[in-house]
């Protein structure tokens, strides 16, 4: 004969848990249903009835199976710096990520609770650390021989132009001017735009540091953001 | 849904101590109030501590409060039972189990939970 399939509820055996999308309720001590992801428990089981469920209402979700008496609220509207990636709807939360040239200084559950601007190295800087979704650009001087003379969040410092002859030397935030004879670039490696980070809903994952001689100033809550950095503007 | 593995159980002397820990995978950890529960030979199922949902609250036993700490490490999906000054009626096979979005302690039911780890104090 085949062993009979019990029904919920029904009182466990000794030792044994319940069964896939069930639990065992403390005050009922048998094994009820769970609610469906979207669902909530509107009556809870008792010895001899199972539980009860009911959809979530406008702006509540549940995303796991679960017998929770009240869905959550899902999370207010993504701030004018985010995008919302994920809408609110009965089976998930809103999720809101940082727009283009702005990082999450502040992470919550998913998402991002509180973005920030990327940092822009001024000319004389360039950029030593691209920003990523959860950190910010690291700005570094420009060494001899290079320079940058553009206030961004994704230049580095490029070689200096090497002239036949040198009409004015370049420095940290100028290129070398030429005379008219043509002038040779240096073949130093580089000269290229970092791209901006893209906000995406995939783990966010912590850069790997790279030594630099200009510090990375952070933001200290609940204050406001902290004065620019060596190098940095908040432009 | 989640799957737990307990780990760290073992023979101690009185006045010892141990630490427990639950590795959760299938879904994120912090989505659940979590509770450690133990079993003596011929006894009820007790809970033992508790942790919410939020993490804005923790529930001892009396019977062990200021010697167990609960913890968790939502980064590491992993949660802890530190245990100290045991005594031999703390001999139990300990579980540990959830409750999603569970807002109060102790848990009003159980979700899934581990095989267990057996805890023995003897001298």
């Known amino acids: 004969l085949p062993a009979q399939v019990a029904f919920t509820p029904y009182a466990p055996e000794p030792g044994s848990t319940c069964r896939l999308r069930e639990y065992y309720d403390q005050t009922a001590q048998m094994c009820c249903s769970k609610c469906s992801p979207g669902q909530h428990a509107k009556v809870f089981c008792t010895k001899t009835s199972d539980t009860v469920c009911d959809s979530c209402e406008d702006s509540t979700y549940t995303q796991l199976w679960n017998w929770v008496p009240e869905c959550l609220s899902c999370g207010s509207r993504c701030s004018s710096d985010q995008v919302e990636t994920q809408a609110c709807t009965r089976e998930q939360n809103r999720i809101c990520t940082c727009r283009p040239g702005w990082y999450c200084a502040l992470s919550k559950q998913e998402g991002c609770r509180l973005c920030a601007p990327l940092r822009k190295c001024r000319p004389g800087f360039g950029v030593a650390r691209p920003g990523t979704e959860t950190s910010d650009v690291v700005c570094k001087p420009c060494a001899p021989g290079t320079f940058s003379n553009t206030t961004s969040s994704t230049d580095i410092c490029r070689p200096h132009q090497i002239c036949n002859v040198v009409a004015i030397p370049g420095n940290a935030s100028m290129d070398a001017v030429c005379t008219s004879t043509s002038p040779t670039r240096s073949m130093a490696p580089g000269a290229v735009h970092l791209p901006q980070p893209v906000s995406t809903r995939s783990q966010h994952t912590q850069p790997t540091p790279e030594p630099s001689t200009a510090p990375s100033t952070s933001f200290l809550l609940p204050m406001g953001p902290s004065p620019p950095a060596e190098g940095s503007t908040g432009d | 849904e989640v799957q737990l593995v307990e780990s760290g159980g073992g023979l101690v002397q009185p006045g010892g101590s141990l630490r427990l820990s639950c590795a959760a995978s299938?879904?994120?950890?912090?989505?659940?109030?979590v509770a450690w529960v133990r079993q003596a030979p011929g006894k009820e199922l007790e809970e033992v501590s508790c942790?919410?949902?939020?993490?804005?609250?923790?529930n001892y036993a009396e019977s062990v409060k200021g010697r167990f700490t609960i913890s968790r490490d939502n980064s590491k999906n992993t949660l802890y039972l530190q245990m100290n000054s045991l005594r031999a009626e703390d001999t139990a096979v300990y579980y540990c189990?959830?409750?999603?979005?569970?807002?109060?302690?102790?848990?009003?039911?159980?979700?899934?939970w581990g095989q267990g780890t057996l805890v023995t104090v003897s001298s």
């Open positions: 942790i919410t949902y939020s993490g804005g609250s923790t």
């Open positions: 299938g879904s994120r950890l912090d989505y659940y109030a």
């Open positions: 189990t959830t409750e999603p979005y569970g807002s109060s302690c102790p848990l009003s039911g159980y979700d899934t």
